[in-house]
């Protein structure tokens, strides 16, 4: 049994770090493997994560880490019974992937303006709460070329656009993701998409 693709880990900067890796063949991750993790330098208990399968040869482990500072670094040991398959380290503050925003809603009743709102995925007492910026993706279900990204660089989880910037009479979908510049994070996953029918009053043409 060998590791084909070494574990890579990301932290949600809240309570969970997720590590993924691939084995060299089909593996029952939960029965055959264990991922041990422990803080470097600080005296603390070693913790064990039981991985789950993620495709035939893929494994994923959700490491519980609920008290983390910038200086913290973890050793990671991947074991198959008594055999050490891989040893590495992981610094949560340097590998942050924010949680995905939720509750994306499109308000279409605001005088030819579309108001998109969503929820910040972090509670107000989390450091990332006031540091997230967003990207909103809007696309047409009918026309694959009608695909646009709006960067929301202010803190408020909302976006206003004129309905007239989109085509009238057709259906659109939107989704949103987040990142935090302060930790040079990766982008979060996209939120679930929401659908609406875009319609607005065309202005009268002047002749």
């Amino acid at each position: 049994m060998k590791v084909l693709q070494e574990p890579t880990c990301v932290s949600d900067y809240m309570s969970i770090s997720t590590c993924e890796w691939k084995m060299n063949g089909p593996t029952n991750c939960s029965t055959e493997l264990r991922l041990l993790y422990q803080l470097v330098f600080l005296l603390s208990e070693a913790h064990t994560c039981i991985p789950e399968n993620n495709g035939g040869a893929g494994c994923v482990c959700h490491l519980l880490m609920d008290d983390v500072v910038s200086a913290d670094n973890y050793t990671l040991d991947l074991w198959a019974g008594q055999q050490l398959l891989w040893k590495g380290s992981f610094k949560p503050s340097e590998h942050v992937k924010p949680r995905a925003p939720g509750n994306l809603t499109v308000h279409t009743n605001v005088s030819d303006t579309l108001l998109l709102t969503w929820s910040n995925p972090y509670p107000p007492d989390n450091y990332l709460y006031n540091h997230l910026t967003y990207a909103v993706n809007i696309w047409s279900e009918n026309d694959p070329a009608d695909f646009r990204i709006y960067n929301v660089t202010y803190l408020e989880p909302s976006l206003r656009i004129a309905a007239s910037t989109l085509k009238s009479g057709i259906s659109y979908r939107a989704r949103v993701r987040a990142w935090a510049q302060c930790y040079n994070t990766t982008w979060s996953e996209w939120s679930p998409s929401t659908k609406w029918h875009n319609s607005y009053r065309e202005p009268f043409e002047q002749h």
């Epitope: 900067y13 005296l43 500072v69 340097e94």
Partner: antibody, heavy 124, light 107 residues
């Protein structure tokens, strides 16, 4: 108002022990990590030890590892430093410091509140 | 461990002038740097964290900049109460380490 008051310092002979205490008030003590930082006469600041809110993780500078033990009593809002096998180079003003941020994920550790310090002199 | 080096050791400045203090890390600490002010007989006071974020109640004349290995604390117009020793501290790695300090004295 956040207050940190250290006590327990004094003159002690090399090889002997001393226990420092820090009484905390003005904040929810059991939400925060706490630390000890010292300053030798005429020198700069040196981090000595730190302890997480639940005592689940503890750290020591190499210079005191194996000799000093940090602990806390959240019910009493108190932080302690048990210093054994003291040496002349442990002579310093010892500060109790509250970690900035809160329990959970946070930047740090840096220290947003400090006590006035308690002086430890190790001499024969 | 990460070694923090501050310069100059002493800075002589007249009240109202600008003071620029430097702090260098032996390896990158990203933005994980704090600055403290320390006066004799008093508790140290947090000025800056995250390399550039002013702590609560700190006047706007104090500003921090830099990332990686080079950091600067600037006091735009020195007031009489600003004469003190200033320390930088990295919190990118355990053990936490401080610079040797810069004493800002009256010229």
């Amino acid at each position: 108002e956040v207050q940190l008051v250290e006590s327990g310092g004094g003159l002690v002979q090399p090889g002997r022990s001393l226990r420092l205490s820090c009484a905390a008030s003005g904040f929810t003590f059991d939400n925060y990590a706490m630390h000890w930082v010292r300053q030798a006469p005429g020198k700069g600041l040196e981090w000595v030890s730190g302890i997480r809110w639940n005592s689940g993780s503890i750290g020591y500078a190499d210079s005191v590892k194996g000799r000093f033990t940090i602990s806390r009593d959240n019910a009493k809002n108190s932080l302690y430093l048990q210093m054994n096998s003291l040496r002349a180079e442990d002579t310093a003003l010892y500060y109790c410091a509250k970690e900035g941020g809160y329990s959970g994920y946070r930047p740090g550790p840096f220290f947003d509140y400090w006590g006035q310090g308690t002086l430890v002199t190790v001499s024969s | 461990e990460i070694v923090m080096t501050q310069s100059p050791a002493t800075l002589s400045v007249s009240p109202g002038e600008r003071a620029t203090l430097s702090c260098r890390a032996s390896q990158s600490v990203n933005y994980n740097l704090a600055w403290y002010q320390h006066k004799p007989g008093q508790a140290p006071r947090l000025l800056i964290y995250g390399a550039s974020t002013r702590a609560t109640g700190i006047p706007a004349r104090f500003s921090g900049s830099g990332s990686g290995t080079e950091f600067t604390l600037t006091i735009s117009s020195l007031q009489s109460e600003d004469f003190a020793v200033y320390y930088c501290q990295q919190y990118n790695n355990w053990p936490l380490t401080f610079g040797g300090g810069t004493k800002v004295e009256i010229k």
